[in-house]
Interface confidence: medium
């Protein structure tokens, strides 16, 4: 009969009494307090709330709670030669001038030290010269402008709107495309919601509000001067100019007020279809340059941050397990703010904070996890992911060996409409059963489960009476955990409705207005949002620290490998003379995801039946499903991007948020009909599908019987 | 380990009703699924209901649907069987099972691996 020896307890710790432990009221307090100040990374402040959470989880029962620190490169504005953006007229002198900062919001007028809206990383310069408006700078944009309506990007300035892909893809197509500068700008048809106010009254953006980020492409990197290793007192750092991931324009964001302004006068092309409109009272013209009038004003940008090397911390809480100490269950998220952080990272912050608390009471009465569970709270990841990344350089050799899962806690919030869970398919089964556990906190579901709401307002586009769960893309602190290092991941946030809601993300995004009275008034007064947030990833982490045999189902992975194997046939079918031409066969990825799929299926027949009260066959099996996920590493990693190595799935490399599957295939065959030589593009097709081949047939063996 | 203990059985008349109790010690910790199998005579094992441990989940087998309730306390660590309009193929030895797998396809499904109570007879007889 199965046993359970990690506890020798009252019949009371269990995962109800974790959930039941849970307090919204509690949220709501840690978060008010976590926003109150600004916590920029490598700023004092941040390093207090660093020490206070360190103090405050060893109050509440962890066995140990450290800080780690790196020495990293971050990005600063110059507090006495502030951006701007002008326009100037043809003697030079300016005749308009961006903002240099947004009005604070109520109550916050005498904060010192909230940083004006930069993009962080960008090098100095004073570009001047006409503007090209090129819609969201997604690749596809640049497709159109280049090659459609022959419009030539080189020494031009580019105005870009924000939303649809990650803003470091946005300046990387742009310097691709020739231009010396990048001014990017929120436009009401992406950040303000219709039948909504602005803030303080709304949860809008107001045209003053700006939205901050850091622009580089590290693919994974970590800290820019020292790739694949931590930034540590020892560390050899590259030169600047030989830094991962650095724009070489100069980048700024503005408002919609400020855009207005620039675009009003634009002349030149019209837009080439509807698309390219935003809400703005103003043409949309393409450009280049000003219309007739204005035809001899040009757009001078002024840019003076720094890059400095500055010290950050994590803090690293744990709690030790009583069977299998060398097992690790992580729960990480972000402590770092670009202002007050309301939303972005403290409403995910304040949970974290809470599944602590009710870890520790749980600890204090006896009980402890089965395996260790592991309590991150990262630094600097809106630089970059620099934190999460730097310690998992440090501690991979622990990690790949020991690593079972990572649970990642940003934003708990990006609304209130439903859940919204990306993850690994080894998690779908136990996101799913816990789901139908949980009491759904929606209005019109009382009573029902949280399942229930979720699949009914987000249904799976393929299977009826299922939730939709969505790849893991990148933009945040599980990348080097499943992205790098093959550890499964999942993230949990309650989300808007993408259907009425076609915004990118949430208006008030990385503005100054993100504040504790955005979430308490306007997002989720009774903090029951929260609440269920805490309950998805807490409990998650519970089973997944606690369960006899790990609650991972390999079926789902064979499942979803046939899906991602037929939709990447499907892309190549588009070619059908060249691959016939140049003998371009997927059998071997289909023979593959075919064996996956019946060794799969044997392994979790065995999984039903095997002796559970035998500890080396209890190991020996949880094993085989801990590195399953490390089976889809390739050491070598994907072409061009060394440290996104998972063969599944990597983030796009046309938007660093989404997640791709088969990457390797798809950038192979993208835009492969433009390629100079079809014979080469067509070779790296054939190389791509050999390697994906191989790893899904590598992978299937691990869950083999052993001998 | 996991001890289940059922009462409640006996003797009654069809269409009358029984209440059965299983009550759980050991430990219970990290049990997720309880529920009911029965066996008849010279028949094979047969799932009757379980519930999850949150209660929001509950399944009846068809046989026994719109007249056997599942109800389960958490607090007392008992899960309880309500047994209206009692019918002669409902006799049985009627067995508490519980469950630690939160995450199968089949949370219901109870084998071998699970603990298992020794069983209370349910005889309907007129």
């Known amino acids: 009969k199965s046993s359970n020896e990690a506890t020798n307890i009252t019949p009371k710790h269990n995962m109800k009494a974790f959930l039941d432990e849970l307090k919204a009221e509690n949220i709501k307090k840690f978060l008010y307090n976590f926003t109150q100040i600004p916590h920029l990374a490598g700023t004092e402040q941040n390093f207090q709330l660093a020490k206070q959470i360190q103090s405050q989880w060893k109050e509440f029962g962890l066995d140990s709670v450290e800080l780690a620190h790196y020495d990293v490169l971050l990005s600063y504005p110059n507090k006495t030669h502030p951006n701007y953006i002008s326009i100037i007229n043809e003697d030079g002198n300016e005749i308009f001038n961006t903002s240099l900062f947004e009005p604070p919001p109520p109550g916050y007028e005498n904060v010192s030290d909230i940083v004006p809206p930069f993009s962080a990383f960008s090098p100095q310069g004073m570009p001047e010269g006409d503007l090209v408006y090129v819609n969201y700078a997604r690749t596809e944009d640049f497709f159109k402008l280049e090659r459609d309506m022959k419009i030539n990007c080189s020494g031009k300035i580019v105005i870009a709107r924000y939303g649809k892909v990650f803003r470091g893809n946005k300046v990387k197509n742009a310097q691709l495309a020739g231009a010396k500068g990048v001014i990017l700008y929120s436009d009401p048809a992406d950040y303000f919601a219709p039948g909504v106010k602005s803030y303080p009254d709304g949860w809008n953006l107001p045209g003053g509000g700006v939205q901050r980020g850091n622009i580089l492409n590290l693919n994974g990197a970590g800290d820019p001067l020292t790739p694949g290793y931590p930034a540590n007192e020892y560390a050899y750092r590259r030169g600047i100019a030989e830094a991962v991931g650095l724009p070489s324009i100069p980048v700024h964001p503005i408002g919609y007020y400020d855009a207005q302004k620039l675009l009003e006068k634009m002349g030149g092309s019209a837009p080439p279809d509807s698309s390219w409109r935003g809400s703005l009272k103003v043409p949309y013209n393409v450009g280049p340059g000003f219309t007739g009038n204005f035809s001899t004003q040009k757009v001078k940008m002024h840019i003076h941050s720094t890059n400095e090397v500055t010290r950050i911390y994590n803090v690293i809480g744990t709690l030790r397990g009583a069977v299998e100490p060398d097992r690790y269950v992580i729960l990480g998220g972000h402590r770092d703010s670009w202002v007050f952080g309301g939303i972005d990272p403290q409403s995910g912050a304040a949970v974290v904070h809470e599944i602590v608390r009710s870890f520790g009471t749980l600890k204090k009465e006896g009980w402890r996890p089965r395996r260790t569970i592991l309590f991150a709270s990262w630094d600097a990841e809106e630089f970059g992911l620099l934190g999460s990344t730097e310690w998992a350089e440090e501690n991979s050799r622990l990690l790949q060996e020991r690593g079972v899962a990572y649970i990642n806690a940003d934003s708990s919030i990006e609304g209130n409409y439903t859940l919204r869970v990306d993850c690994t398919p080894l998690m779908y089964s136990l996101v799913h059963n816990l789901t139908k556990e949980l009491k759904s906190p929606d209005e019109g579901f009382e009573g029902k489960s949280l399942y229930e709401s979720w699949t009914k307002k987000s249904p799976s586009p393929e299977f009826s009476g299922m939730p939709r769960i969505s790849k893991l893309g990148s933009g945040n602190d599980f990348e080097v955990f499943f992205q790098r290092l093959g550890i499964a991941s999942g993230r949990a946030r309650y989300t808007k409705n993408w259907e009425t809601n076609k915004f990118s993300g949430y208006p008030l995004y990385h503005s100054v207005y993100e504040t504790y009275e955005l979430v308490e008034k306007f997002y989720d007064p009774m903090f029951k949002y929260h609440l269920t947030v805490a309950q998805v990833r807490g409990g998650m982490v519970f089973e997944l620290a606690n369960s006899i045999v790990l609650p991972f189902d390999c079926r789902d992975y064979a499942v979803v490998l046939r899906k991602y194997a037929d939709k990447i046939y499907s892309i190549s079918m588009k070619h059908p003379q060249e691959m016939k031409t140049y003998s371009v066969s997927f059998d071997s990825l289909f023979s593959a995801v075919k064996n996956f799929t019946e060794i799969a299926s044997k392994f979790s027949e065995r999984l039903q039946d095997f002796d559970k009260s035998n500890p080396i066959v209890l190991r020996m099996m949880n094993d085989q499903l801990m590195f399953l996920e490390r089976a889809f590493i390739d050491p070598l990693g994907l072409p061009d991007r060394p440290f996104y190595r998972h063969v599944i799935y990597a983030p796009s490399s046309h938007n660093k948020y989404a997640g791709e599957s088969f990457p390797g295939i798809y950038d192979a065959l993208f835009d492969i009909e433009s390629k100079v030589d079809p014979s080469k593009a067509w070779g790296e097709v054939k190389r791509q599908i050999y390697v994906a081949a191989f790893t899904v047939q590598a992978a299937a063996e691990t869950l083999s019987e052993v001998a | 380990q996991v001890q289940l203990v059922e009462s409640g059985g006996g003797v009654v008349q069809p269409g009358r009703s029984l209440r059965l109790s299983c009550a759980a010690s050991?430990?219970?910790?990290?049990?997720?699924?309880m529920g009911w199998v029965r066996q008849a005579p010279g028949k094979e094992r047969e799932f009757v209901a379980a519930?999850?441990?949150?209660?929001?989940?509950?399944l009846v087998s068809d046989s026994v649907k719109g007249r056997f309730t599942i109800s389960r306390d958490n607090s007392k660590n008992t899960l309880y069987l309500q047994m209206n309009s009692l019918r002669a193929e409902d006799t049985a030895v009627y067995y508490c099972?519980?469950?630690?797998?939160?995450?199968?396809?089949?949370?219901?499904?109870?084998?071998?691996?699970?603990?298992w109570g020794q069983g209370t007879q349910v005889t309907v007889s007129s």
């Open positions: 519930i999850s441990w949150s209660g929001l989940n509950r």
């Open positions: 050991g430990r219970t910790f990290g049990i997720y699924v």
């Open positions: 099972a519980a469950s630690n797998r939160l995450y199968g396809r089949t949370w219901y499904d109870f084998n071998e691996s699970d603990y």
